[in-house]
Interface confidence: medium
């Protein structure tokens, strides 16, 4: 298309801190929309800017502004991630544990200079509040992780940014959007008990406390029932149990019964990121000649 000699919009730019795509409007137009890649579209506020919620400061993204009348469009790429290739933090990962703690870790970029320092910022999707890392994990003075003991500022999806600084060269940044449900590691189930009568054994347990607000339907459990003093390589009995209001599993086991142990682990039914196993609970007799469960 031929370039408009008098475009209605000029000086398209991103105000990164405010997360606003803004421009100069040179004449009256009807309806302006902003499009991020193809994925998100939004109407402009008073035809003067678009307010975004979670712009990436690392992933180069196309931002297009379209005018309905007169028909016109223009675009920019943001950001232009400056800094030497390979200097950004890498192998970034976070996990929530013990229901209210989070650790994030990363590694120094392969081409980062010796004086590189990294800083972690977290922004939630709703309140646009920025959380700065309160406690850094260090390796030879370089920040390579972060510990948070207050997760009240997080929402279901959060934006993580690792910035870098150096006196020698520009450092690229790393960013990522993470869902809390995908990064939470459950504690094992608690209060595991086994009660047996002459014919059956009943295992009960409590669902683990979690950061997410989950119902019993969101849990899946695995029970590992293991007979003691068996030959190496003998298979354990792994039982899958769906979460219930009262978590219990009843299985036939007649007296006299050999010594067994049971341990349980938990996962989100949709993700199946298993927790560690609970402490093994033993039941039955020490006599190795008795029957199995």
């Amino acid at each position: 298309t031929k370039e408009d000699p008098n475009p209605p919009i000029t000086n398209l730019r991103m105000k990164a801190k405010a997360q606003q795509l803004t421009w100069d409007l040179n004449r009256n137009v009807t309806d302006i929309e902003c499009v991020k890649d193809a994925d998100y579209s939004m109407p402009a506020v008073n035809n003067s800017y678009c307010q975004f919620g979670a712009i990436s400061l690392c992933e180069v993204t196309n931002y297009t502004v379209r005018v309905a009348n007169p028909p016109f469009s223009t675009w920019i790429l943001f950001p232009e991630n400056s800094g030497r290739e390979g200097t950004a933090a890498q192998n970034f990962s976070c996990f929530i544990y013990n229901a209210d703690l989070m650790n994030c870790t990363w590694a120094r970029g392969p081409t980062a200079p010796r004086d590189v320092q990294y800083f972690l910022y977290i922004r939630n999707s709703k309140r646009r509040r920025e959380i700065r890392c309160p406690y850094y994990i260090q390796d030879s003075g370089t920040h390579v992780g972060c510990h948070l003991d207050n997760l009240s500022g997080l929402t279901s999806r959060n934006y993580f940014l690792v910035n870098g600084t150096s006196r020698e060269i520009g450092i690229q940044f790393f960013d990522s959007l993470l869902d809390t449900k995908k990064i939470e590691r459950f504690n094992p189930p608690s209060n595991v008990t086994v009660r047996c009568n002459t014919t059956h054994c009943l295992v009960r347990w409590k669902q683990p406390r979690t950061y997410q607000k989950l119902s019993y339907l969101d849990f899946q459990y695995q029970l590992d029932v293991h007979r003691k003093n068996t030959q190496p390589g003998t298979e354990n009995l792994l039982i899958n149990v769906s979460g219930d209001l009262e978590n219990r599993y009843n299985f036939p086991s007649s007296e006299p019964r050999a010594k067994h142990s049971v341990k349980i682990r938990a996962a989100d039914v949709r993700i199946l990121n298993w927790s560690s196993w609970s402490e093994a609970i033993e039941f039955g007799s020490d006599d190795g000649n008795l029957g199995s469960v």
């Epitope: 929309e33 193809a38 196309n62 309905a68």
Partner: antibody, heavy 125, light 107 residues
């Protein structure tokens, strides 16, 4: 319950024109971007057109640009596709599709949350 | 245009088994991949959005994963009602494009 009902499919000669309609119900039509997607006899899906909730902005792939026009009448809860200069490659089942709800102020118009049953367009002499 | 390649073209499985569908993009699309199911003589139905986000009303046996160029749709334990064609679609850039589909059939 979201319901999309397409109509207007027919047998048309090459070079001819046709207008498809889609009647929407079960949701606030004026709040959602809408699209047309077609599927040929080999079952290939192809996105054809998208219009934003207010009707000001339209999107087309190069294969139909200049020949097809998507429009909507929010007062009638209806979506339309005006097709002209039709050729045999336009033979397909045409589906009307609703985009997702708005999300933090964004209008997600790039994936298809609900589909109609389709209306068949055959271009042949 | 971004080309999406789905493999295999046909998958034959026994009921109760786990099955995986692959979708590969010709360039990085982040997580902007969506999955649809189309049963015989039916219309497409959204299963998974943004690579791994679940959809209300879709059975929990369906899950998705992947980012960049490689994506997977999993069915935990196939049921007879899952016999259908499965399509991926990208929304990273215009034009929106679909894969050619994978047909799931029972052994």
């Amino acid at each position: 319950e979201v319901k999309l009902v397409e109509s207007g499919g027919d047998l048309v000669k090459p070079g001819g024109s046709l207008k498809l309609s889609c009647a929407a119900s079960g949701f606030t039509f004026s709040n959602y971007a809408m699209s047309w997607v077609r599927q040929n006899s080999e079952k290939r899906l192809e996105w054809v057109a998208t219009i934003n909730s207010g009707g000001s902005f339209t999107y087309y792939p190069d294969s139909v640009k200049g020949r097809f026009t998507i429009s909507r009448d929010n007062a009638k809860d209806s979506l339309y596709l005006q097709m002209s200069s039709l050729n045999s490659e336009d033979t397909a089942m045409y589906y009307c599709a609703r985009q997702s709800e708005a999300y933090y102020g964004y209008d997600k118009r790039t994936w298809f949350a609900y589909w109609g049953q389709g209306t068949l367009v055959t271009v042949s002499s | 245009d971004i080309l999406l390649t789905q493999s295999p073209a046909i998958l034959s499985v026994s009921p109760g088994t786990r099955v995986s569908f692959s979708c590969r993009a010709s360039q990085s699309v982040g997580t902007s991949i969506h999955w649809y199911q189309q049963r015989p003589n039916g219309f497409p139905r959204l299963l998974i959005k943004y690579a791994s986000e679940s959809i209300s009303g879709i059975p929990s046996r369906f899950s998705g994963s992947g980012s960049g160029t490689d994506f997977t749709l999993n069915i935990n334990s196939v049921e007879s009602e899952d016999i259908a064609d499965y399509y991926c679609q990208q929304s990273k850039s215009w034009p929106l494009t679909f894969g050619a589909g994978t047909k799931l059939e029972l052994k």
